[in-house]
Interface confidence: low
C-alpha cells in the first residue's frame, strides 16, 4: 500500500488529525520536499543577521550579515566583525597587525611580510601594516658593470631599506 | 550563480610558456582574493599563489617564484595564471580558487589541463 | 613550510558504517583569534575539490551533518559519521596560516 502522504508536494504538509489530507504550512514554516509530517519553522533574520531571502511555503529563509560584519559556517550560522585593512579580529576585538606582517583585506589574519634577501632580492618598497613588501631587483643587478661575483646583499629584516 | 569558469585544456612544448584564465561570476570580484592550485598525476594538490583581486598584489610559492605571475583584469572580472619555462614536470591539472572566509577555498574552478609534450 | 601529514591514505569503507582521517600539522595552526586554521577538502572523481570543513571545526555551507571537524593540537580529524557513496573521493587537509599554504598527501576513501 502507498503511503498516503507520499502525495503530499512541498510546501504542504500531511496532517494526521486531518485524516492524512495534505495541509498547507503555516504561517512562517515551510516544507522543503513532499512527504512530510510536519512542516519546518522558518530561520528569522535578527540582530547582526539580516535577511538575503525571505522564507516561502517551500524554502526557508536565508541569512547574511549587516554591514561591518561577514558570515561564518553552513549557512551563515554566525557573523563575524569586519576590521579594517592593517588589522585582524582577535577574540579582544580588531586590532592592528603587529610590526613585519599585513593584511590587505577586511578580514582574514595578519601575515609576514615577504622576505626579499630569501630569494637574494633588495626591498624596493617597505611594508606596511595594510601592504606586503615590494621586493626589486637583486642587488647584484642594481648597477649595470656589477660583476657576477658581487657577493650578495646582507640579510636584512623585511620591509627595512637597503642601507 | 557564484562560479569560476576556467580556460579550456592546453598543450605546450617543453621551454614555452602558457596562461590560464579564471573568469568570475555571481559576485564582487575585488572583494575576494584568487589563489591557484594545482594537482599533478599522483601528487597531492600544490598551492602555487594568490591575487589579492582588488588591489592586483600577489604573493607566490617559492616553489614556482620566478616561473608564475598571477595577473587579473577587474573590467572582464578574470584571474590569470601564467607560468614559464614548462617542464614534463608541469603536466598537471590548474585550478583558480576564490578564498572565502578564513583562508578556505569556497568555490573553485573546473581545473585545467596542461600537458607538456615535445 | 608547514608540513601537513594525513593518515591513513587508503581507507576502504562499508557504506553505513563512519570513517575517520587524521591530519596533522608540523606547526601549531591555533591562531591569536582562537581559530585553528586548519580545512579539509574532498576531490571527487572528475570534478574539482569541495570544500567540507574551515577553521578546524566549522562546516561549509551545504555540507551534511554527517562530516565533523575536531581538534586536539596538532592533530585533526575529519569524521564521517555514516559513509554514502558520494563520499568517495580524496580527503585533503590544508593549512591556510601560513604563506604557502600547504596540503597533506591525501586520503582516498573507496567502498568495500
Known amino acids: 500500500l502507498q503511503d498516503p502522504c507520499s502525495n503530499c508536494p512541498a510546501g504542504t504538509f500531511c496532517d494526521n488529525n486531518r485524516n492524512q489530507i495534505c495541509s498547507p504550512c503555516p504561517p512562517n514554516s515551510f516544507s522543503s520536499a513532499g512527504g512530510q509530517r510536519t512542516c519546518d519553522i522558518c530561520r528569522q533574520c535578527k540582530g547582526v543577521f539580516r535577511t538575503r531571502k525571505e522564507c516561502s511555503s517551500t524554502s526557508n529563509a536565508e541569512c547574511d550579515c549587516t554591514p561591518g560584519f561577514h558570515c561564518l559556517g553552513a549557512g551563515c550560522s554566525m557573523c563575524e566583525q569586519d576590521c579594517k585593512q592593517g588589522q585582524e579580529l582577535t577574540k579582544k576585538g580588531c586590532k592592528d597587525c603587529c610590526f613585519g606582517t599585513f593584511n590587505d583585506q577586511k578580514r582574514g589574519i595578519c601575515r609576514p611580510w615577504t622576505n626579499c634577501s630569501l630569494d637574494g632580492k633588495s626591498v624596493l618598497v617597505n611594508g606596511t601594516k595594510e601592504r606586503d613588501v615590494v621586493c626589486g631587483p637583486s642587488p647584484a643587478d642594481l648597477s649595470p658593470g656589477a660583476s657576477s661575483v658581487t657577493p650578495p646583499a646582507p640579510a636584512r629584516e623585511p620591509g627595512h631599506s637597503p642601507q | 550563480q557564484v562560479q569560476l569558469v576556467q580556460s579550456g585544456a592546453d598543450v605546450k612544448k617543453p621551454g614555452a610558456s602558457v596562461r590560464v584564465s579564471c573568469k568570475a561570476s555571481?559576485?564582487?570580484?575585488?572583494?575576494?582574493?584568487i589563489h591557484w592550485v594545482r594537482q599533478a598525476p599522483g601528487h597531492r594538490l600544490e598551492w602555487m599563489g594568490w591575487s589579492n583581486a582588488g588591489i592586483g598584489n600577489a604573493k607566490y610559492s617559492q616553489e614556482f617564484q620566478g616561473r608564475v605571475t598571477i595577473t587579473r583584469d577587474t573590467s572582464a572580472s578574470t584571474a590569470y595564471m601564467d607560468l614559464s619555462s614548462l617542464t614534463s614536470e608541469d603536466l598537471a591539472v590548474y585550478y583558480c580558487a576564490r578564498e572565502g572566509v578564513a583562508g578556505a577555498f569556497d568555490i573553485w574552478g573546473q581545473g585545467t589541463m596542461v600537458t607538456v609534450s615535445a | 613550510d608547514i608540513v601537513m601529514t594525513q593518515s591513513p591514505l587508503s581507507l576502504p569503507v562499508t557504506p553505513g558504517e563512519p570513517a575517520s582521517i587524521s591530519c596533522r600539522s608540523s606547526q601549531n595552526l591555533l591562531h591569536s583569534n582562537g581559530y585553528n586554521y586548519l580545512d579539509w577538502y574532498l576531490h571527487k572523481p572528475g570534478q574539482s575539490p569541495q570544500l567540507l570543513i574551515y577553521?578546524?571545526?566549522i562546516r561549509a555551507s551545504g555540507v551534511p551533518d554527517r562530516f565533523s571537524g575536531s581538534e586536539s593540537g596538532t592533530d585533526f580529524t575529519l569524521k564521517i559519521s555514516r559513509v554514502e557513496a558520494e563520499d568517495v573521493g580524496i580527503y585533503y587537509c590544508?593549512?591556510?596560516?601560513?604563506?604557502?599554504?600547504?596540503f597533506g598527501q591525501g586520503t582516498k576513501l573507496e567502498l568495500k
Open positions: 590544508m593549512q591556510p596560516l601560513q604563506i604557502p599554504y600547504t
Open positions: 577553521l578546524g571545526s
Open positions: 555571481g559576485y564582487t570580484f575585488t572583494s575576494y582574493p
